[in-house]
Interface confidence: low
């Protein structure tokens, strides 16, 4: 197969290089090209350096990561980490800071809370929830983190949860929770975490943290 | 037990406006997202809108985008459907919807109100 390869890159190589050898005579006027050869080569050659240009411009708009094989599968990640919030609400806020990633605008980080992609495909989804707790300070009920889908047309769906005891220590106990998993996302499709108690949430470094890859 | 119970069906001209509503019953209200589904005669269910639990996120057919408002009044448990500029091809049953907690992209739904566009 690598033989077959090498064959048909050289054999490219040659039709380019003669593509551009054509350009040369027809710039230095030589006879044997017809006026409307060299017209219809240098469109041709136009046609290529605009579409170089447009493809570094896109490139450059939808790409911080290098292409996988094909530029029609750009690689598509995101790590976000998490941002203490004033709000009440049990979705946890996430921000892009530190080291964070965010390969292109195929998957943005939406209010703050949720990633959504544009692309369909099969994405490993994450995310590492660190709280503290105290058990005579917390309510019975454990600390739950909920991996949460929403889709276009489709009510919002649980794709994973966890949960956690509170701890003993005072006067809190870290734990961290790890969620995990491989789903078939629709082009839209938004993903965000909830937890039970958001004020448990360790913000510190390295902490908490979410995000998505493209397999 | 779940009821949700549409009203404000009936006959409107092309052009013309409903407002649909959906008083819901047997569950925490505003711990859900709700939505709205059609089944015109003789099709399958097309969804219609959806919108979150607190209304900040809200979700559009193509075929109704900038025509349909949906919204919600959690203190009423009451869920809306503003339909402006109807078309022939919005006439349909209407139906309330609301995610069966732990099913997969399931609903309950209402008995349903009829929307007929005739001129």
């Known amino acids: 197969h690598r033989r077959l390869d090498k064959i048909e890159d050289e054999r490219n190589l040659h039709e380019d290089f003669v593509f551009m050898k054509t350009i040369q005579r027809c710039n230095t006027g030589e006879r044997s090209l017809s006026l409307l050869n060299c017209e219809e080569i240098k469109s041709q050659f136009e046609g290529f350096v605009k579409d170089i240009m447009l493809n570094k411009e896109e490139t450059k708009k939808e790409n911080s990561f290098e292409m996988q094989k094909g530029d029609q599968n750009p690689q598509i990640a995101a790590h976000v980490i998490s941002e203490a919030s004033s709000k009440t609400t049990s979705v946890l806020q996430w921000a892009e800071k530190g080291y964070y990633t965010m390969s292109n605008n195929l998957v943005t980080l939406e209010n703050g809370k949720q990633l959504t992609v544009k692309r369909q495909g099969l994405y490993y989804i994450y995310a590492q929830v660190t709280f503290c707790s105290n058990r005579e300070a917390s309510s019975q009920a454990p600390f739950i983190a909920s991996l949460c889908l929403k889709s276009p047309g489709r009510f919002e769906r649980i794709l994973l949860r966890a949960a956690n005891t509170h701890s003993s220590a005072k006067p809190c106990g870290q734990q961290s929770i790890h969620l995990g998993g491989v789903f078939e996302l629709q082009p839209g499709a938004s993903v965000f975490v909830n937890v039970t108690d958001p004020s448990q949430v360790s913000h510190g470094t390295g902490f908490t943290s979410f995000g998505l890859l493209k397999l | 037990e779940v009821q949700l119970l549409e009203s404000g069906g009936g006959l409107v001209q092309p052009g013309g406006s409903l407002r649909l509503s959906c008083a819901a019953s047997g569950f925490t209200f505003k711990a859900y997202d709700m939505g709205w589904v059609r089944q015109a005669p003789g099709k399958g269910l097309e969804w219609v809108s959806q919108i979150g639990r607190d209304g900040s996120f809200t979700y559009y057919a193509d075929s109704v985008k900038g025509r349909f408002t949906i919204s919600r009044d959690n203190s009423k448990n009451t869920l809306y459907l503003q339909m402006n500029s109807l078309r022939a091809e919005d006439t349909a049953v209407y139906y309330c919807?609301?995610?069966?907690?732990?099913?997969?992209?399931?609903?309950?739904r209402g008995q349903g109100t009829l929307v007929t566009v005739s001129s």
């Open positions: 919807a609301k995610p069966r907690r732990y099913a997969i992209f399931t609903f309950d």
